[in-house]
């Protein structure tokens, strides 16, 4: 089953997020991803946990998953590099870099997104954009077209409260509010974009969606700048 959903969002403007990727398993959407370099897509490590025998590909330039679009192209994956410290039972270090079989053909609908390198928290209350093809309601309806939602960043202390994530949110993670509008599982790997810069990647741990006491959890890319640079080098 696909990992992820955007709840309470709306259809995105077509191709307005040219960095957006769909990580696919055997031809079906599995997770979100974000193009960070011509030949590299950043996603979440947990996305590939159950993909051992399947064919992993990356769809770029898409708005609709099913309809033909001139900018759409499916790329094979040359190499999958999960963060070395990622583990199945924790949300920590939930990052994955996918090297495409060739450099992506860039254009208005396919373009890498600048990512944050300065290791400083995004100010609480900042509105950030998260997008994905995950299910759009609790009944499990899957959208064909890309959805997005604007979410305010939540301070880490609140996110670490016992009734929220009870101390699980390290300095390498960040949270966004989840009051009916939310990302969830299968938007996993997708981008959290603040001020036009990639700040976070949707984690793929199982989590109640749309409940304000269980905020969305995002891996802070700035905290992993050294690792990302070392893989892309």
């Amino acid at each position: 089953p696909p990992r992820g959903r955007i709840l309470g969002g709306r259809e995105a403007e077509a191709h307005a997020r040219p960095y957006m990727a769909s990580v696919q398993l055997n031809g079906a959407h599995l997770c979100g991803g974000v193009l960070v370099a011509e030949q590299w897509v950043l996603s979440a490590a947990h996305c590939l946990e159950d993909a051992a025998d399947g064919k992993v590909q990356v769809l770029l330039g898409a708005h609709s998953l099913s309809q033909p679009e001139p900018s759409k192209r499916l790329y094979d994956v040359l190499r999958a590099v999960p963060h070395p410290d990622s583990q199945p039972d924790t949300i920590d270090h939930d990052l994955l870099l996918l090297q495409l079989s060739e450099k992506a053909t860039l254009g208005p609908a396919v373009r890498p997104l600048p990512w944050q390198r300065v290791d400083r928290d995004v100010a609480p209350g900042t509105l950030c954009d998260v997008a994905g093809w995950g299910i759009v309601n609790h009944a499990g309806r899957r959208p064909d077209s890309l959805q997005h939602v604007l979410l305010p960043v939540l301070d880490r202390a609140t996110c670490n409260r016992r009734t929220h994530h009870d101390g699980a949110i390290t300095e390498r993670l960040m949270c966004a509010e989840s009051n009916r509008r939310d990302s969830c599982k299968g938007d996993s790997g997708g981008p959290l974009v603040c001020g036009g810069v990639l700040e976070g990647v949707v984690t793929s741990g199982s989590r109640v969606c749309g409940n304000r006491k269980k905020p969305g959890i995002y891996t802070r890319v700035a905290s992993y700048a050294a690792w990302i640079d070392s893989v892309l080098a």
Partner: antibody
């Protein structure tokens, strides 16, 4: 190593105020709420209130509204609790505790004795 | 406020025995998010409390597996399978699901 270092014992007169401190180390101060508890001699614990160290927003047990005021100083990673209009009923050990996970980390407690 | 009632008040045991402490809440302590924030703490004389169990049955890191928590709704139990000398002290249950959070009155575990 997470540590919460509380200020020393206080002997105060009835009607006076006292401000006790809880200095955090071993973690990022602003990443966790700070809670305060009271324990009278031989009795159980009572929750006084909590404070978000990012913005100073505090929540209080109704029972302690007007009695306790919680503040923080981010620059010194210290949480404070001021108790006012003290009576002998306020004589107790006061604990600070970090919230997350649960109350896994506590200060050693500050004994406040109210006596003429 | 949610009243947390512990029984017994005092529990004399022999080392190696099993001990069981009950905690009852005056209303359900299932939080609106679906979780139950019932915790157990041990306070040794002259010390601050130590977290043993969180969310009813989860042992905090470093807590020996002879400690186990169970229960739901309004009735909860802490069991110590084989009491050791270092286990002596006062045990408190705590609910963090409703504001204000509240502690039980405590159960003193002592040598028979």
């Amino acid at each position: 190593e997470v540590q919460l270092q509380q200020s020393g014992p206080e002997l105060v007169k009835p009607g006076a105020s006292v401000k006790i401190s809880c200095k955090a180390s071993g973690y990022t101060f602003t990443d966790y709420y700070k809670n305060w508890m009271r324990q009278r001699h031989g009795e159980s614990l009572e929750w006084i209130g909590d404070i978000n160290p990012n913005n100073g927003d505090a929540n209080y047990n109704q029972k302690f509204k007007g009695k306790a005021t919680l503040t923080v100083d981010k620059s010194s990673s210290t949480a404070y609790m001021e108790l006012r209009s003290l009576t002998s009923e306020d004589s107790a050990v006061y604990f600070c505790a970090r919230e997350g996970p649960s109350f896994a980390y506590w200060g050693h407690g500050t004994l406040v004795t109210v006596s003429a | 406020d949610v009243l947390m009632t512990q029984t017994p008040l005092s529990l004399p045991v022999s080392l190696g025995d099993q001990a069981s402490i009950s905690c009852r809440s005056s209303q359900t302590i299932v939080h609106s998010n679906g979780d139950t924030y019932l915790e157990w703490y041990l306070q040794k004389p002259g010390q601050s409390p130590n977290l043993l169990i969180y969310k009813v049955s989860n042992r905090f890191s470093g807590v020996p597996d002879r400690f186990s928590g169970s229960g739901s709704g309004t009735d909860f139990t802490l069991k110590i399978s084989r009491v050791e000398a270092e286990d002596l002290g006062v045990y408190y249950c705590f609910q963090g699901s409703h504001v204000p959070p509240t502690f039980g009155g405590g159960t003193k575990l002592e040598i028979k």
